[in-house]
């Protein structure tokens, strides 16, 4: 078991459960989106490979005042082994492209769904 408690259920939860809950939160965001997500804020695009969770958090943590992604930020922090703060880019190896938060969430969601369906939970 991976210790990912705090955003859905108390105590440790299996990695599959944590990943599924993150996916469901991202689905909720994309399906409930009315106005431009986070007022069209731009974030750094990331490589969806090793260290993806920390990189995603480092990118999204720089968006402030957007309640729609606060839960996602908290969930991602459960997957990232180190503390992440705004302006930190240790996992963001490539910083050459900025995309809208909405597109970032869609890309991340598509990748996480594939990982889940393949059974890659860690």
């Amino acid at each position: 078991l991976t210790c990912l408690g705090g955003f859905a259920s108390p105590g440790p939860v299996p990695p599959s459960t944590a990943l599924r809950e993150l996916i469901e939160e991202l689905v909720n965001i994309t399906q409930n989106q009315k106005a431009p997500l986070c007022n069209g804020s731009m974030v750094w695009s990331i490589n969806l490979t090793a260290g993806m969770y920390c990189a995603a958090l480092e990118s999204l943590i720089n968006v402030s005042g957007c309640s729609a992604i606060e839960k996602t930020q908290r969930m991602l922090s459960g997957f990232c082994p180190h503390k992440v703060s705004a302006g930190q880019f240790s996992s963001l190896h490539v910083r050459d492209t900025k995309i809208e938060v909405a597109q970032f969430v869609k890309d991340l969601l598509l990748h996480l769904k594939k990982l889940f369906r393949e059974g890659q939970f860690n």
Epitope: T17, R20, I23, R117, E118, G119
Partner: antibody, heavy 123, light 107 residues
């Protein structure tokens, strides 16, 4: 309107390979979040999930049968195939194909089913 | 594997009755529970997904509830066309597993 239809050999002998085809319409397996699965039901018994394949070609199998199963798809002809190697009389059942999931969430709900095709393994 | 148990294999009720069919999982399945109806001719239809969400085209007399390991399907006003076998299925973890089914008959 979503429809699925299974076809198979009807009868085959032990040790042969069972080839099943699921032909579907009303949706495309190039559409994100959709999959097609195979389920079987021996006469008078319960349902058993065998395998499924997703739009992006991710394949999952029932571990109890994995060594004997092969699932594949032909997106352009809207067909999904299942092969079961080295069949035995225990493989005698009605075989169903079903579409999996369209909600965007991963609930593994099989929202539309075919009518089923009867397969008998007998020497 | 997660075992799904439908303790009642057959059930007899009168038209207009409220009928409840139960399903128990061998571990917490976190509401990933789907219900299917299989008619005597073998036709299978999804009724309820994710514990309580009604599939499109399914009459509102069908409802689902439950949490953790215990789930139920309720038919509020039994109709002749509800004569069928009902199966639960967990979608929490692979392999996907089904209950043994509950056959519903008219008294």
């Amino acid at each position: 309107q979503v429809t699925l239809k299974e076809s198979g050999p009807g009868i085959l002998q032990p040790s042969q390979t069972l080839s099943l085809t699921c032909s579907f319409s009303g949706f495309s397996l190039s559409t994100s979040d959709l999959g097609v699965g195979w389920i079987r039901q021996p006469s008078g018994k319960g349902l058993e999930w065998l395998a499924h394949i997703w739009w992006d070609d991710v394949k999952r199998y029932n571990p109890a049968l994995k060594s004997r199963l092969t699932i594949s798809k032909d997106t352009s002809s809207s067909q999904v195939f299942l092969m079961i190697a080295s069949v035995d009389t225990a493989d005698t059942a009605t075989y169903y194909c079903a579409r999996i999931g369209s909600s965007g969430y991963i609930y593994y709900e099989m929202d539309y089913w075919g009518q089923g095709t009867s397969v008998t393994v007998s020497s | 594997d997660i075992q799904m148990t439908q303790t009642t294999s057959s059930l007899s009720a009168s038209l207009g009755d409220r009928v409840t069919i139960t399903c128990r999982a061998s571990q917490d399945i976190r509401n990933y529970l789907n219900w299917y109806q299989q008619k005597p001719d073998g036709t299978v239809k999804l009724l309820i997904y994710y514990t309580s969400r009604l599939h499109s085209g399914v009459p509102s007399r069908f409802s689902g509830s439950g949490s953790g390991t215990d789930y139920s399907l309720t038919i509020s006003n039994l109709d002749q066309e509800d004569i069928a076998t009902y199966f639960c299925q967990q979608g929490n973890t692979l392999p996907l597993t089904f209950g043994g089914g509950t056959r519903l008959e008219i008294k």
